[in-house]
Interface confidence: low
């Protein structure tokens, strides 16, 4: 229903602390350089607006759209262009223009320093004075470094973060009370944010029906006893949700994601058995939980999937009069047989399906044509699962770093224009993949590990897309999403890259390095991996782990020595030769 | 388009021997394990052996154990089915699929194999 005044409407469906939380991530997802002072107190402006447009509707401006309104204080801003350059020009543009080129100006890799997390102490100390501040630094903070982080999910991880210093503030050893809790949060909090963005580029570079047939696809899985006419529903509403979150509406984003899970839970019957722990929950936890629930239990007399898609008489007939539909029956029902699958491989067969109904419904024997479709799935599927098993193999062997190691040999070879520091982060975070899914039961490792490294790749692209740089990454990258991480997997050796000469300095070492955290000394480690393999491409794994090992010896000897400094000066050059020859 | 060719059956007698193969073509046939399937008149398709991508590994049906030996050539894209000691219960219709899968992986229409006297 239309309200008088938008702004209102949303302040009540949200209530005071969610609508000042999605606001300040609004504003610091938009404009990624404003300081949190800077932001709160525009919150603390459009708050007030709000609360008078609750008691008067019809008061001065209430009436604009939530984007005229926003982006009014965003222009308002000080020094935006000394600030931030092009972006200024939005401010000449008129809504929905406006908002459009605010959206294009978010930029995935800001030149902000990583987040650190101040000591158990300070923590302490600050959250307790001021809970409420607390907590906005860390939704400023997150949401300026992720500019498309899911917005009310960023309010449940900002509700996690605040029940942990809540309990470990009160221990004696806060410490070791909240650095694990803290990691694990934070690690979630990553790999949300990963997934969410690679919604958000399906959303825009594919447009709404790529998200709904992933959503189709996911939700069938999940929900393998709800009908087509259920999962149909749901698919749009969720496609609904993520639509205003990618499209910076985060307030009915925010609403619409609430309304959502009520209607779940008012429908389990027809939705699922395994919600009921979820509904139990309040508003921000209820949403987490629906949204990661575990899969229901298949119905155990679903016919054979060719009854309906190959062997029926019908099927170009059917097809024909509905293609969509008759496509998102074929992905429902393929889905809801195959929660051991990734989505991505769920939408390449449905894609193959597609295709060959096209193909085979303009012959003169159809049946004929499209009968072997079903055995034609069959490399699709192994492709998958033969990548799992080589991975998850590998990783057991050698453990997460040094299964990121491997990785980044892999991608530099096959990338090795990119950048070192893109690579490095590309594969610390392919490698985690290991740990986050060869470890789970058999038949959750491929979807675990598909959709995982997708995501993944899609920060790659993304951020390659800045500055195109290999002719192998923008191949696979202006593909469809679905067929990305299987272009990733083909690629080898790239054959038209010239290698970097040796040059000593980058293996140059000293002994500050002996004082950095165990992630900061392998990130030290890896850039040189990555290096050593831009020099030599097609380095053996043995050489390559020769001298690797030399250079751990080496950090390892001189970070034990009385003088850490000679050791570094006589030693270092000593290993630069050795690593020449090792290459030679 | 993924393309299986079976070849090699034929009728033999009890205790004879034949080799099965199978032509590949269409998808990377090194990177995929591949089954042989048999289905006999009136029963459901059953699968007599599998190999690995690199041959290193297989396994066989009980029914065949110590009998059947399959193999395969990557560089040929070929896959063989060794079968000694034949009895009237292995005929069937050989196929070749690709993966642990019993339904065929393409157009071909498996080989004949008729054990009698």
């Known amino acids: 229903e239309a309200h008088k005044s938008e702004i209102a409407h949303r302040y009540n469906d949200l209530g005071e602390q969610h609508f000042k939380g999605l606001v300040l991530i609004a504003f610091s997802q938009y404009l990624q350089k404003c300081s949190y002072d800077e932001h709160a107190k525009l919150v603390q402006e459009v708050t007030d607006f709000a609360k008078t447009c609750v008691a008067d509707e019809s008061a001065a401006n209430c009436d604009k759209s939530l984007h005229t309104l926003f982006g009014d204080k965003l222009c308002a801003i000080p020094n935006l262009r000394e600030n931030y350059g092009e972006l200024a020009d939005c401010c000449t543009k008129q809504e929905p223009e406006r908002n459009e080129c605010f959206l294009q100006h978010k930029d995935d890799n800001p030149s902000l320093p990583p987040f650190e997390r101040p000591e158990a102490e300070a923590m302490c100390t600050s959250f307790k004075e001021n809970p409420t501040t607390f907590m906005g630094h860390y939704l400023h903070e997150v949401a300026r470094r992720h500019p498309y982080f899911y917005a009310p999910e960023l309010l449940y991880y900002a509700e996690q973060y605040n029940e942990i210093l809540t309990q470990c503030c009160a221990e004696a050893d806060k410490e070791s009370c909240l650095t694990p809790k803290l990691d694990g949060v934070k690690e979630k909090a990553l790999v949300s944010s990963v997934r969410q963005r690679m919604k958000c580029s399906s959303m825009q570079k594919f447009g709404e029906r790529a998200f709904k047939a992933w959503a189709v696809a996911r939700l069938s899985q999940t929900f393998p006893n709800a009908d087509f006419a259920e999962i149909t529903k749901l698919a749009t509403d969720l496609t609904k949700v993520n639509k205003e979150c990618c499209h910076g509406d985060l307030l009915e984003c925010a609403d619409d994601r609430a309304e959502l899970a009520k209607y779940m839970c008012e429908n389990q019957a027809t939705i699922s058995s395994k919600l009921q722990t979820c509904c139990d929950k309040p508003l921000l936890k209820k949403a987490h939980c629906l949204s990661e629930v575990e899969h229901d239990t298949m119905p155990a007399d679903l016919p054979a999937i060719a009854a309906d898609f190959v062997e029926d008489q019908e099927v170009c007939k059917n097809y024909a009069e509905a293609k969509d539909v008759f496509l998102g029956t074929f992905l429902y029902e393929y889905s809801r047989r195959h929660p051991d699958y990734s989505v991505s491989l769920l939408l390449r067969l449905a894609k193959k399906y597609e295709a060959t109904l096209e193909k085979c419904c303009a012959e003169a024997n159809p049946p004929a044509c499209y009968g072997t479709v079903l055995a034609e799935f069959q490399p699709l599927v192994e492709e998958p699962k033969n990548l799992v098993k080589t991975n998850c193999d590998l990783y057991e062997k050698l453990g997460e770093y040094g299964f990121q190691n491997a990785i980044l040999v892999r991608y530099t070879q096959k990338a090795p224009q990119v950048s070192t520091p893109t690579l490095v982060e590309a594969a610390r975070n392919l490698g985690r993949v290991g740990t986050k899914c060869c470890t789970l039961p058999e038949d959750q490792r491929l979807p675990c590990v598909e959709d995982y490294l997708s995501a993944i790749l899609n920060r790659v692209c993304l951020l390659h897309e800045k500055t195109p740089v290999s002719e192998h990454v923008t191949k696979c990258c202006s593909g469809s999403l679905v067929e990305r991480r299987p272009c990733f997997s083909a690629l080898t050796v790239d054959e038209t890259y010239v290698p970097k000469e040796f040059k000593a300095e980058t293996f140059t070492f000293h002994s500050d390095i002996c004082t950095l955290p165990e992630k900061e000394k392998q990130i030290k480690k890896q850039t040189a991996l990555a290096e050593l393999v831009k020099h030599k491409p097609k380095a053996t794994a043995e050489q390559l782990k020769t001298v690797m090992d030399d250079f751990a010896q080496f950090l390892d000897t001189c970070c034990k020595a009385a003088d850490k400094d000679t050791c570094f000066s006589t030693e270092g050059p000593n290993l630069v030769t050795r690593c020449k020859d090792a290459l030679a | 388009q993924v393309q299986l060719v079976e070849s090699g059956g034929g009728l033999v007698q009890p205790g004879g021997s034949l080799r099965l193969s199978c032509a590949a073509s269409?998808?990377?046939?090194?990177?995929?394990?591949m089954s042989w399937v048999r289905q006999a008149p009136a029963k459901g398709p059953e699968r007599v052996s599998a190999?690995?991508?690199?041959?290193?590994?297989?396994i066989y049906a009980d029914s065949v154990k110590g009998r059947f030996t399959i193999s395969r050539d990557n560089a040929k894209n070929t896959l063989y089915l060794q079968m000694n000691s034949l009895k009237p219960e292995d005929t069937a219709v050989y196929y070749c699929?690709?993966?642990?899968?019993?339904?065929?992986?393409?157009p071909g229409q498996g080989t004949q194999v008729t054990v009698s006297s």
């Open positions: 269409g998808f990377t046939f090194g990177q995929f394990g």
């Open positions: 699929t690709i993966g642990s899968s019993t339904t065929p992986s393409g």
């Open positions: 190999i690995s991508s690199d041959g290193s590994g297989t």
